[in-house]
Amino acid sequence: QNASRGRRQRRMHPNVSQGCQGGCATCSDYNGCLSCKPRLFFALERIGMKQIGVCLSSCPSGYYGTRYPDINKCTKCKADCDTCFNKNFCTKCKSGFYLHLGKCLDNCPEGLEANNHTMECVSIVHCEVSEWNPWSPCTKKGKTCGFKRGTETRVREIIQHPSAKGNLCPPTNETRKCTVQRKKCQKGERGKKGRERKRKKPNKGESKEAIPDSKSLESSKEIPEQRENKQQQKKRKVQDKQKSVSVSTVH
């Protein structure tokens, strides 16, 4: 990365340029490079108790470069900073620190969260969902005919996925019970499939979170002649069972 490193090897007096190595324009016995060839950056490297001048093609990690008219100079960033724009503004922190508004922090401030890829503090993003789409047609085993109980589904899209500390997304699918319109199925009629994929029917004891309490929803949908007494309902249940056997064989 910083290939043009120049330090002198032979003994010589300060400011004598003959014999300077690499990118040095002038150098000294004790301090190494004193100035650099054009376009190279001058940096001071600490070796033990002394500082040695070196000439580099770009400033090393932890330093930033200033192009003065007479010298390109590398200046140290703050201790916790890996890359900086200047002394005040860090642009990449050292490992274990998070960048926030040009500063390196151990932890992100309240209301922000750490992004462990960029190592920056970012705003917490909460889930956002669209409005519900219209309910799908009422179907039973994919059919929209034959007077029986079915289900209808509606969906909504996730507009904004949440970040790690953001609020989780609410359900994006909702299913409720409904009554298939009172209409005889034509022979071999397959029925109009609903727009929704068939949802797997929850087993007993399985969570029905996405299925709201449908009693109140159903009652508002029923028309008077659809109301049945308990005896009729029992009778229908037996008929439904027989029908569903024959229906299930239709492919």
């Epitope: 724009f85 002394k87 503004f89």
Partner: antibody, heavy 116, light 107 residues
């Protein structure tokens, strides 16, 4: 809190001299290159000169070279601009600023009017 | 010296508008660009450094982008306090140079 307070501005005749001062506080003055930036009435910003953190090197815009001298006293946290042979085109608000690639801290400015 | 050309030189807009100011460098300056805001009778205030990084305390409606020679400052939804003059400055090398400024006025 960072503060830069300029003083020394005023009305002066062409060819005369003026010395501006800038008192700094709230940051490590000796760590920063310091500059003067000026703004003529109704015009844009124009960099005038910069002195590096230890006072060893100074840089000037061409139009002020040989007339203006920039110096600093790190023991007093103060920046100076000695302006000689003033011209009408030097009329401006002069801002003192901490210069580290960008101008991070600014004073409130002092007005210099060169008029006969 | 590197020349910085800002456009437009003035701009009328309303509260809530999205506004974009551009700055063009006469040579490649990488991302070494700074934006300042100046209100009448006040000193300039640093808004954005390294072309796109927001200074502490600057509202997130301000954003900067660009690299090389073309840069933009965007205010996503103008607020009454944003009516001011904006300057770009290249920090790539000496001598530091500014754009001529963009005065943002209320329509």
């Amino acid at each position: 809190e960072v503060q830069l307070v300029e003083s020394g501005g005023g009305v002066v005749q062409p060819g005369r001299s003026l010395r501006l001062s800038c008192a700094a506080s709230g940051f490590t003055f000796s760590d920063y290159d310091m500059a003067w930036v000026r703004q003529a009435p109704g015009k844009g910003l124009e960099w005038v000169a910069t002195i590096i953190y230890d006072g060893s090197r100074t840089y000037y815009r061409d139009s002020v070279k040989g007339r203006f001298t920039l110096s600093r006293d790190n023991s007093k946290n103060t920046l100076y601009l000695q302006m000689n042979s003033l011209r009408a085109e030097d009329t401006a608000v002069y801002y003192c600023a901490a210069h580290d690639r960008s101008f991070d801290y600014w004073g409130q400015g002092t007005m210099v009017t060169v008029s006969s | 010296d590197i020349q910085m050309t800002q456009s437009p030189s003035s701009l009328s807009a309303s509260v809530g508008d999205r506004v974009t100011i551009t700055c063009l460098a006469s040579e490649d300056i990488s991302n070494d660009l700074v934006w300042y805001q100046q209100k009448p009778g006040k000193a300039p205030k640093l808004l954005i450094y390294a072309a796109s990084r927001l200074q502490d305390g600057v509202p997130s409606r301000f954003s900067g982008s660009g690299s090389g020679t073309d840069f933009t400052l965007t205010i996503s939804s103008l607020q009454p306090e944003d009516f001011a003059t904006y300057f770009c400055q290249q920090s790539y090398k000496y001598l530091p140079t500014f754009g001529q400024g963009t005065k943002l006025e209320i329509k």
